[in-house]
């Protein structure tokens, strides 16, 4: 037997406004650094790639996603240490032999020059001048992303 | 030499509120269900347990999180078939040799009575009426939370 | 541009073979279930089957079950349908479809142009 | 299996009328149910998911309605380019299965 509450819940909210539009960040939250449309947080502490994309579930956000060249430049000028590195949410597939986005993506060859190895275990970090291949047990900094803002049929519906 | 956007990036917005209040959501997406101060998505396809931290982390979401007894069977109260399988923000550590939350807590051991081994490569899957420890890649369900209302002084501080 | 776009119908005796493919474009591809949907000419819609993001877990409907087989190629972006011991009343135009979210199986909004495929001696 | 009914089957209109389809589950489905519209050698285009959603770009003269087993498509002021059929669809369990459609002709 259900109770007022889960009754509740498992209505999905008919009574409420049924827009596509998601409320959004409007602006970034302490700490974080607006870049263009993304808030970006830039970890001081270091973790394995695991989890800093645990930590940044946990934080309602992602690990960095790349677009472009461009995006990737923006970012760097960001980095005020040449020597740090930092994960961002994209690793190699094994079993498709690929590096791929943690969006389910693969990476377009164009947009990061990657040096060190694509193979099991490597994972991609960023500094302030390069992109590397890293195993992913090694623990490093890592950058969260928020989007900005509010954005109109971005649904995610049940899942 | 930095552009003016990066100037602006760097600079947290010092120009803004310095409220520690991040927006949160006031109400559930479309097909998110409410779950007390938590909007849960209960998906409908599966994946293996990394692939749906990653699908919860690039939705702005986490994984479950389970407080306690009284939040799982709130949550179990919401599925509908005693056959379906959830992951949720769970998994074993091999290192430290416990089961570890996303947000990096270990299980408090009363909190959840698990069926099946504490070994490496597994992760914690929810029932209607039982806790599963599962091979992390098994393909089943999962659930991902977002945080409803805006809460105050979460900080997200660097990390 | 965000597109699927199937290939691989045509004319075929009934108890023989073809496989379709739908290659998409302008999404992320792996993050999504994906299904194949038929339309028999002058009928309704018939879901066939779907198959998950990752592409270990598979779905069909009663009527192609031990025939047809659903398979992905992530990184090709590439959506296959293989059809075995093919019937007369396999004739349809075949779809492609994505849903809308990733952790949906329908809601389909992004759907090929359609390949016909004829069973016919 | 859910088996979604289409009523009416056809429907007769001209432009500027409302038109109403329904839709009937046969079990409980919440909230779970997509419609389309297809044109002749087009392919289905989504209009409403979850029951009362409007998808992106589609005219807000469609609304859809219901929960449990009812559900309702409707079209404010008809206009010349939604004479067409329209599916429902439920994804609430797999199999997914469509209604049988409801064809909008001109009168």
């Known amino acids: 037997q259900k109770s007022s509450i889960e009754k509740c819940s498992v209505d999905i909210q008919q009574s409420r406004n049924k827009t596509t539009e998601r409320p959004g960040l409007l602006n970034c939250p302490i700490y974080w650094q607006q870049l263009r449309e993304k808030c970006l947080l830039f970890s001081h502490t270091v973790n394995p790639w695991n989890n800093s994309l645990a930590d940044c579930s946990t934080k309602e956000s992602s690990l960095l996603l790349i677009r472009d060249k461009d995006e990737l430049i923006h970012t760097q000028n960001l980095i005020r240490d040449k020597a740090i590195l930092f994960w961002i949410g994209l690793n190699f597939s094994l079993s498709e032999k690929n590096w791929k986005w943690i969006n389910g993506s693969f990476l377009n060859s164009n947009d990061l020059e990657i040096r060190g190895d694509a193979k099991e275990n490597s994972c991609i970090s960023i500094s302030q001048t390069s992109v590397y291949s890293e195993y992913c047990s090694t623990e490093i900094r890592w950058i969260c992303q928020k989007e900005l803002t509010p954005v109109r049929n971005k649904v995610y519906p049940d899942s | 030499q930095k552009s003016s956007i990066e100037k602006c990036s760097v600079d947290i917005q010092q120009s803004r509120n310095k409220t520690t209040e991040r927006p949160g959501l006031l109400n559930c997406p479309i097909y998110w269900q409410q779950l007390r101060e938590k909007c849960l998505l209960f998906s409908h396809t599966v994946n293996p347990w990394n692939n749906s931290l990653a699908d919860c982390s690039t939705k702005e979401s986490s994984l479950l999180l389970i407080r306690d007894k009284d939040e799982l069977i709130h949550t179990q109260n919401l599925i509908r078939d005693k056959a379906i399988l959830f992951w949720i923000g769970l998994n074993f550590s091999l290192s430290e040799k416990n089961w570890k939350w996303i947000n990096g807590s270990f299980l408090n051991s009363n909190d959840l009575e698990i069926r099946g081994d504490a070994k490496e490569n597994s992760c914690i899957s929810i029932s209607q009426t039982s806790v599963y420890s599962e091979y992390c890649s098994t393909e089943i369900r999962w659930i991902c939370q977002k945080e409803l209302t805006p809460v105050r002084n979460k900080v997200y501080p660097d990390s | 541009e965000v597109q699927l776009l199937e290939s691989g119908g045509g004319l075929v005796q009934p108890g023989g073979s073809l496989r379709l493919s739908c290659a998409a474009s302008?999404?992320?591809?792996?993050?999504?279930?994906m299904s194949w949907v038929r339309q028999a000419p002058g009928k309704g819609l018939e879901w066939v089957s779907a198959?998950?993001?990752?592409?270990?877990?598979?779905y069909y409907a009663d009527s192609v079950k031990g025939r047809f087989t659903i398979s992905r190629d992530n990184s090709k972006n590439t959506l296959y349908l293989q059809m075995n011991s093919l019937r007369a009343e396999d004739t349809a135009v075949y779809y492609c479809?994505?849903?809308?979210?990733?952790?949906?199986?329908?809601?389909?909004?992004?759907w090929g142009r359609g390949t016909l495929v004829t069973v016919s001696s | 299996d859910i088996q979604l009914t289409q009523s009416p089957s056809s429907v007769s209109a001209s432009v500027g009328d409302r038109v109403t389809i329904t839709c009937r589950a046969s079990?409980?489905?919440?909230?779970?149910l997509a419609w389309y519209q297809q044109k002749p050698g087009k392919a289905p285009k989504l209009l409403i998911y979850?029951?009362?959603s409007l998808q992106s770009g589609v005219p807000s003269r469609f609304s859809g309605s219901g929960s449990g087993t009812d559900f309702t498509l409707t079209i404010n002021s008809l206009q010349p380019e939604d004479f067409a059929t329209y599916y429902c669809?439920?994804?609430?369990?797999?199999?997914?299965?469509f209604g049988g459609g409801t064809k909008v002709e001109i009168k």
């Open positions: 479809a994505k849903p809308l979210d990733s952790s949906q199986w329908a809601d389909f909004d992004l």
């Open positions: 198959i998950s993001a990752a592409g270990g877990t598979t």
């Open positions: 079990q409980g489905i919440s909230s779970w």
């Open positions: 302008g999404f992320t591809f792996g993050q999504y279930a």
């Open positions: 669809q439920q994804a609430w369990v797999l199999p997914i299965t």
């Open positions: 979850a029951a009362s």
